[in-house]
């Protein structure tokens, strides 16, 4: 039956050579005429190649619907099926022509240097190597290498067919890298092209969905899910999908093979599920299955469908975050929303930008939290479609484990004269404030270096049993004062003081402060000496560039060989509970200093003078004296602090103010600096002089104007000056009201 014209019954086209197979010799002419009942066309071997320039198809001279195919000087490669057919139908007549070319018995596929055969290693699979022959009855064998093996047709599973090629069970050549066919003609061997052997299989490596998770859409949007199966080569794949609304009318499925790089041992298949206008009923689990017949693999993902775009905070969103100094803080913005919101963080109303210390994204991360990070953080979520906004405030509280602020924490402490009353102080800074500060003590000799104790440089005191200060038996009489609270350097600190009534015994004292996030401790070496005594001349802490003398006074009848040393830099204690090194037991760290000796009737006085003191002169100074009788060394330590020179500054502003006649004005001007600045007052740029109505107190810090008059109105300036310069603040005082006439007090005071 005709495909093109079903109403007309057509006979098959008629060929001039009425044979199924024609055998002709090479270099002869092939000519076949085809006649029919409608338009005809010819198909011939390799007619997609350049060889058709040799092929002539001409209309017959003697009638309609007739075409002659002519190939002069045929070659072996012209072997194959010649087909005459009615256009746009399946009706055709075919003749198979062998062009016997004994010099090339195999038909070379056009432009091929080599071919590829894909095989599996399975025993029940056969493979066809397509070495077609130009001669039908050739004696053909298959050569495989390496190692070299030859396979000969066995009348069963191994065979050669000139129209098909060489058939062999695939496992027999699965070891080989390449195969070719070989024909023997009159003791001459002829080879086909090489075929590279590629072993393939059925295995599916994995099935991957994309997007793989967290798929959220709102009603009406398009869902596109890609399912990719990666397989061995030469695998065919069936895909199937399972999803909530399988009867969906807007569903579209497209399956296709994906191109993989040449040389890849893998094939990729893709199935795409598209749902155009998604509805709430499409929410649910979407599963893609890929199957090769011997292996099925599946993967699933959940698709969430929202009624409309929205944004809200999740129930787990915190309102209070507590952290300890130095920790990494993570505050996640827990939200529900579609599409994902834009997230912006603010601290006390100021937008936060990410840098090396802070990352402001889905999670606010503070790398190493410090006290200044305490505050209120606002996170604002904005839905990118609806522009709906939601905000939430998180309070961050940063806790500080107790820190004990005395400088002596990291250096040996002064020696104390026998019998004196002494006060030891621990100033603790902690958030929250310490819930207790406890004092402990231990006799110095119980902690002294003994050969039996293993003592490290970092922990020189093998102190084990600290005793509570309530139990001062065998030690100094002690009284612990009630904790006081002080604002120091702008911070609320807790000050604990321990009073030693009489310094009789050398001991170690430890204060320990504990709050909810940690503990801090300080060990004070309380070395009592009957030996030399150190005094400072003048008796105050020097400032840079001032001169100071350290006097070491010792009873001449008891001591000799007075020497001044400075303690060299020590490794700072690294661990909580580390103790300062006992100075006299470690003379290696001392530097000898030049000094001048004076004597009076009973004492030797060794004076070490520091002219133009600098910050480098700060440190611990040690006076060493030797007992004349026992030759035992006594040492006394004095910590010298050199104050930095600081230019004057005035804290607090002088406020402009309005006052009525007859009232009083009181203002203060607090200045700081080193050396301490001198304060002077000016009115309208003239020096203000004290009299009965104008009182300056506390080193001119406080100015009082009693019973003000109209003339007191003006610009008042407080100026603080030292050798390092001046600072000043100004305020305008306005005096209101009518002047009362009185002769009692014409006190006014302007020069």
């Amino acid at each position: 039956a005709s495909v093109g014209l079903p109403s007309v019954s057509l006979d098959l086209p008629r060929l001039s050579i009425q044979k199924d197979i024609l055998t002709i010799k090479a270099n002869t002419t092939l000519q076949i005429t085809c006649r029919g009942q409608r338009d005809l066309d010819w198909l011939w071997p390799n007619n997609q190649s350049g060889s058709e320039q040799r092929v002539e198809v001409t209309e017959c001279s003697d009638g309609l619907f007739c075409k002659t195919l002519t190939i002069p000087k045929v070659i072996g490669n012209d072997t194959g099926a010649y087909k005459c057919f009615y256009r746009e139908t399946d009706l055709a007549s075919v003749i198979y022509v062998y062009v016997q070319d004994y010099r090339s018995p195999f038909i070379a596929s056009v432009s091929d240097q080599h071919g590829v055969v894909y095989i599996t290693e399975n025993k029940n699979k056969t493979v066809v190597i397509p070495c077609l022959g130009s001669i039908s009855n050739l004696n053909v064998s298959l050569c495989a290498r390496y190692p070299e093996k030859r396979f000969v047709p066995d009348g069963n599973r191994i065979s050669w067919d000139s129209k098909k090629g060489f058939t062999i069970p695939s496992y027999m050549i699965s070891y080989a890298g390449m195969v070719f066919c070989e024909a023997k003609i009159n003791d001459e061997s002829y080879q086909s092209i090489m075929y590279i052997v590629v072993v393939v299989g059925y295995r599916i490596y994995d099935v991957v969905l994309s997007p793989s998770h967290g798929i959220e859409l709102s009603v009406g949007e398009k869902l596109v899910l890609n399912c990719t199966a990666r397989t061995e080569l030469n695998v065919g794949i069936d895909f199937n999908w399972e999803y909530p609304s399988s009867k969906h009318q807007h569903k579209k499925l497209v399956n296709r093979d994906l191109k993989t790089q040449s040389g890849s041992e893998m094939k990729k298949f893709l199935s795409t599920l598209t749902i155009d206008g998604i509805t709430r009923s499409d929410q649910g689990l979407y599963t893609c299955a890929a199957s090769s017949g011997l292996m099925t693999k599946k993967n699933s993902t959940f698709v969430r469908v929202h009624e409309k775009p929205f944004v809200a905070f999740g129930s787990g969103m915190e309102s209070l975050v507590e952290a300890t100094v130095g920790e990494r803080v993570r505050i996640p913005a827990k939200y529900l929303g579609y599409p994902p919101p834009e997230i912006k963080w603010y601290k006390n109303g100021i937008p936060l930008e990410s840098n090396h210390t802070i990352k402001a994204g889905h999670v606010l991360t503070i790398m190493e939290v410090s006290e200044r990070d305490t505050g209120n953080y606002t996170v604002i979520l904005t839905n990118p479609i609806s522009k709906e906004k939601q905000s939430h405030v998180v309070s961050l509280v940063v806790y500080v484990p107790p820190q004990i602020g005395e400088k002596s924490l990291i250096s040996p402490v002064d020696s104390y004269q026998y019998g004196t009353t002494q006060t030891l102080t621990c100033t603790v800074y902690a958030i929250p404030p310490p819930h207790h500060i406890h004092w402990y003590w231990q006799l110095e000799e119980e902690c002294a270096n003994e050969p039996s104790h293993a003592v490290s440089v970092t922990n020189p005191y093998p102190c084990e049993e600290w005793r509570s200060v309530e139990d001062f038996q065998g030690g100094n009489k002690i009284e612990v004062n009630k904790n006081q609270f002080a604002l120091i350097e702008g911070k609320n600190k807790t000050v604990s003081t321990l009073v030693i009534q009489a310094a009789n015994v050398s001991a170690l004292y430890k204060c320990e402060a504990v709050n909810k996030v940690g503990r801090g401790e300080r060990v004070i070496s309380f070395h009592v000496t009957r030996g030399p005594e150190i005094t400072l001349q003048p008796d105050m802490q020097p400032t840079e560039q001032e001169s100071v003398s350290l006097w070491c006074t010792a009873d001449r009848s008891t001591f000799e060989n007075l020497t001044w040393y400075k303690l060299g830099p020590q490794p700072l204690p690294i661990h909580v509970g580390e103790l300062p090194t006992p100075v006299c037991k470690n003379l290696d760290t001392l530097w000898k200093l030049n000094a001048t000796m004076f004597s009076n009737s009973t004492n030797d006085i060794l004076i070490m003078e520091l002219k133009n003191a600098s910050l480098q002169d700060q440190g611990d100074y040690v006076c060493l004296a030797q007992d004349r009788k026992t030759k035992k060394r006594h040492c006394v330590v004095r910590q010298l602090t050199v104050l930095e020179r600081v230019a004057p500054t005035i804290t607090g502003n002088l406020e402009n103010q309005t006052t009525s006649i007859g009232e009083s004005i009181e203002v203060s001007c607090t200045a700081s600096g080193n050396p301490p600045p001198q304060i002077m007052w000016f009115k309208d740029n003239e020096t203000l002089v004290e009299d009965s109505g104008i009182v300056l107190k506390d080193g001119n810090r406080n100015l009082t104007i009693r019973r003000v008059r109209k003339e007191d109105e003006g610009l008042y300036t407080c100026q603080a000056c030292s050798v390092l310069g001046c600072a000043k603040v100004e305020a305008f005082f306005i005096i209101e009201g009518a002047q009362e006439k009185t002769n009692l007090e014409h006190h006014h005071h302007h020069h």
Epitope: N122, R203, D238, E242, A289
Partner: antibody, heavy 117, light 112 residues
Framework: EVQLVESGGGLVKPGGSLKLSCAAS????????MSWVRQTPGKRLEWVAS????????YYADSVKGRFTISRDNAKNTLYLQMNSLKAEDTAVYYC??????????WGQGTTLTVSS | DIVITQDELSLPVTFGESVSISCRSS???????????LNWFLQRPGQSPQLLIY???TRASGVSDRFSGSGSGTDFTLKISRVEAEDVGIYYC?????????FGSGTKLEIK
Amino acid sequence: EVQLVESGGGLVKPGGSLKLSCAASGFTFSMYGMSWVRQTPGKRLEWVASISIGGSYTYYADSVKGRFTISRDNAKNTLYLQMNSLKAEDTAVYYCARELDGNYDYWGQGTTLTVSS
Amino acid sequence: DIVITQDELSLPVTFGESVSISCRSSKSLLYKDGKTYLNWFLQRPGQSPQLLIYLMSTRASGVSDRFSGSGSGTDFTLKISRVEAEDVGIYYCQQLVEYPFTFGSGTKLEIK
């Protein structure tokens, strides 16, 4: 609950034909590869045939190739095995099995085929 | 085809003791993806086979942790600790590395 129920077994003369069915329930049939496995009277298990989820790809054991055809009807949740040119050595209990990742994770209770003259 | 051998046809055992069932393959079942494609099945008397272990050592869902699989590329062992009455039946191993997938001849676990 996953259930596979085979049917269609019986006594057949050598050279005869028979069609086995396997009704599946309790899972989405079209999402799983399916196979037939037989157990000989000597209790040996032998894989017979497999089919892909859509039915496009089929595989057979050498011993049945050209005689047996595996097919499926996903609309009816049913797997089939058409057996032609039956031989005495085809006598066995035939199981249908569900396959995932190549593993036969659920098996039916089996149906018996006896080929004898 | 890959030949799977189970040497012990029968293995008598006492309740409460541990037992090991062996299986050998004519070719390595270690595939290039690093996985070993060997499965174990149990067929209880009068029932159909049930998957116990896949990929040599992974227990199928619902399988007791008394069952454990181990092995190399060609030699495999199924260990059952503290044998119970419900463990009686024929144990088959199966390879999945190459088609056709082949089964061992089975080892019958019976009570002494």
